[in-house]
């Protein structure tokens, strides 16, 4: 029977800069029941606080609700593992909420084949930003990527779309069914998961080349 091994805070994420969650990996338990607590203070302060919510984020997590989240302050946190034989502490982790945002996937992905009379046909892809993100405040710049592939193809092709919420693709294989997905990230954060795939059947008379 031993003191617990050193835990590690391995990830912190925020969906929208208004709340965030951090997760830790326990070290070895030393063969004894082990309690974990996360403590933190804000940069420039000495007062230590304990994690306000160990439930919302699941096992080995700490969730910071709106009233505990501030964009303009760096959080310095550590996890303490304790059993009957002693304690061990994780390394301190410095967290700036601005840099840990991972939004939900974009919404309302719509894909359509456009066949104008006077121009070459194209695939028109359109989507909306995730609902949790408030783009009107200017705090957020969301960037988007699209990926698509024929249903039976092994590799996706990925396109960076900048801040635009629509994208055109020419030159597709006629008669094939394509899968299309979109994802987003804030300018300083992490890519969201890909949205659910939308399927589109390319007509057999689609002009292949431009």
């Amino acid at each position: 029977q031993l003191p617990p091994g050193k835990p590690e805070i391995f990830k912190c994420r925020s969906p929208n800069k208004e709340t965030f969650t951090c997760w830790w990996r326990p070290g070895t338990d030393g063969g004894l029941p082990t309690n974990y607590s996360l403590t933190y203070h804000r940069e420039g302060e000495t007062l230590m606080h304990e994690c306000p919510d160990y439930i919302t984020g699941g096992p080995n997590s700490c969730h910071f609700g709106k009233q505990y989240t501030s964009m303009w302050r760096t959080y310095i946190m550590m996890v303490n593992a304790t059993n009957q034989m002693g304690s061990s502490f994780s390394d301190e982790l410095y967290v700036d909420v601005t840099y840990i945002v991972q939004p939900d996937p974009p919404l309302e992905l719509a894909v359509e084949v456009k066949q104008p009379e006077d121009r070459k046909p194209y695939l028109w892809i359109k989507w909306s930003p995730p609902t949790l993100i408030d783009l009107k405040t200017g705090w957020f710049t969301l960037l988007y990527e699209i990926r698509l592939k024929p249903e039976k193809a092994a590799e996706w092709e990925i396109h960076f779309a900048g801040q635009q919420t629509e994208f055109k693709i020419l030159s597709l294989h006629p008669g094939q069914k394509y899968l299309v997905q979109v994802r987003c990230k804030p300018d300083h954060g992490y890519w969201s998961a890909w949205s659910p795939a939308t399927f589109i059947q390319i007509p057999s008379d689609f002009t292949m080349n431009d």
Partner: antibody, heavy 118, light 111 residues
Framework: EVQLLESGGGLVQPGGSLRLSCAAS????????WHWVRQAPGKGLEWVSD????????GYADSVKGRFTISRDNSKNTLYLQMNSLRAEDTAVYYC???????????WGQGTLVTVTS | QSVLTQPPSASGTPGQRVTISCTGS?????????VHWYQQLPGTAPKLLIY???WRPSGVPDRFSGSKSGTSASLAISGLRSEDEADYYC???????????FGGGTKLTVL
């Protein structure tokens, strides 16, 4: 017929400024992404900047970030590159290029030479 | 540092098949971003030759073809002609740079 004509290049001293223009005709200018790409004498191509069709997104190579500004005037069918704090290593032929789907550069201008020397 | 690596030179005789490689990394070609190829004839502006890995713009002969696998892409030119003598560049978006990357270019000589 697609036509792209760059202008505004010339000789400038280090620390100086230039504004390049790219006048486009023969298609709907506002529907496309636009790029600036440069080529130093005897060297390869280097991407400089791009701007999205709705002007909402602008991107820059690290080597020019904070010194160059890309912009567009859809009413004049013209792309611009404002170059400030120019350095000797900015000496190159500057090309404008139209960005189609996947932002591939499907048409290029003939280029304008920028020479930065004291 | 993100780079696309091309051989500086390649050569072949008329009628031969020549392949030019473009090797990237997990932040560009390996990430899934598409590869474009440009041809620059001496003293002229670059011209789009292959786009989105393997598509040919109208007007480009079918002697030119592109492919992509993993972190690399290739341009193949079959039935080599003297007018193919040019510099060839690959290009791909790079996620870590948030910008376009060009390969260093390959000078093709037709012997």
């Amino acid at each position: 017929e697609v036509q792209l004509l760059e202008s505004g290049g010339g000789l400038v001293q280090p620390g100086g400024s230039l504004r390049l223009s790219c006048a486009a005709s023969g298609f709907t200018f506002s529907s496309y992404w636009w790029h600036w790409v440069r080529q130093a004498p005897g060297k390869g191509l280097e991407w400089v900047s791009d701007i999205s069709s709705l002007s909402s997104y602008t991107g820059y190579a690290d080597s020019v970030k904070g010194r160059f500004t890309i912009s567009r005037d859809n009413s004049k069918n013209t792309l611009y590159l404002q170059m400030n704090s120019l350095r000797a290593e900015d000496t190159a032929v500057y090309y404008c290029a139209r960005g189609l789907d996947a932002r591939r550069m499907d048409y290029w201008g003939q280029g304008t030479l920028v020479t930065v020397t004291s | 540092q993100s780079v696309l690596t091309q051989p500086p030179s390649a050569s072949g005789t008329p009628g031969q098949r020549v392949t030019i490689s473009c090797t990237g990394s997990s932040s560009n070609i390996g990430y899934g971003y598409v590869v474009h190829w440009y041809q620059q004839l001496p003293g002229t502006a670059p011209k789009l030759l292959i786009y989105r890995n393997n598509w040919r713009p109208s007007g480009v002969p079918d002697r030119f073809s592109g492919s992509k696998s993993g972190t690399s892409a290739s341009l193949a030119i079959s039935g080599l002609r003297s007018e193919d003598e040019a510099d060839y560049y690959c290009a791909a978006w790079d996620d870590s740079l948030n910008g376009w990357l060009f390969g260093g270019g390959t000078k093709l000589t037709v012997l």
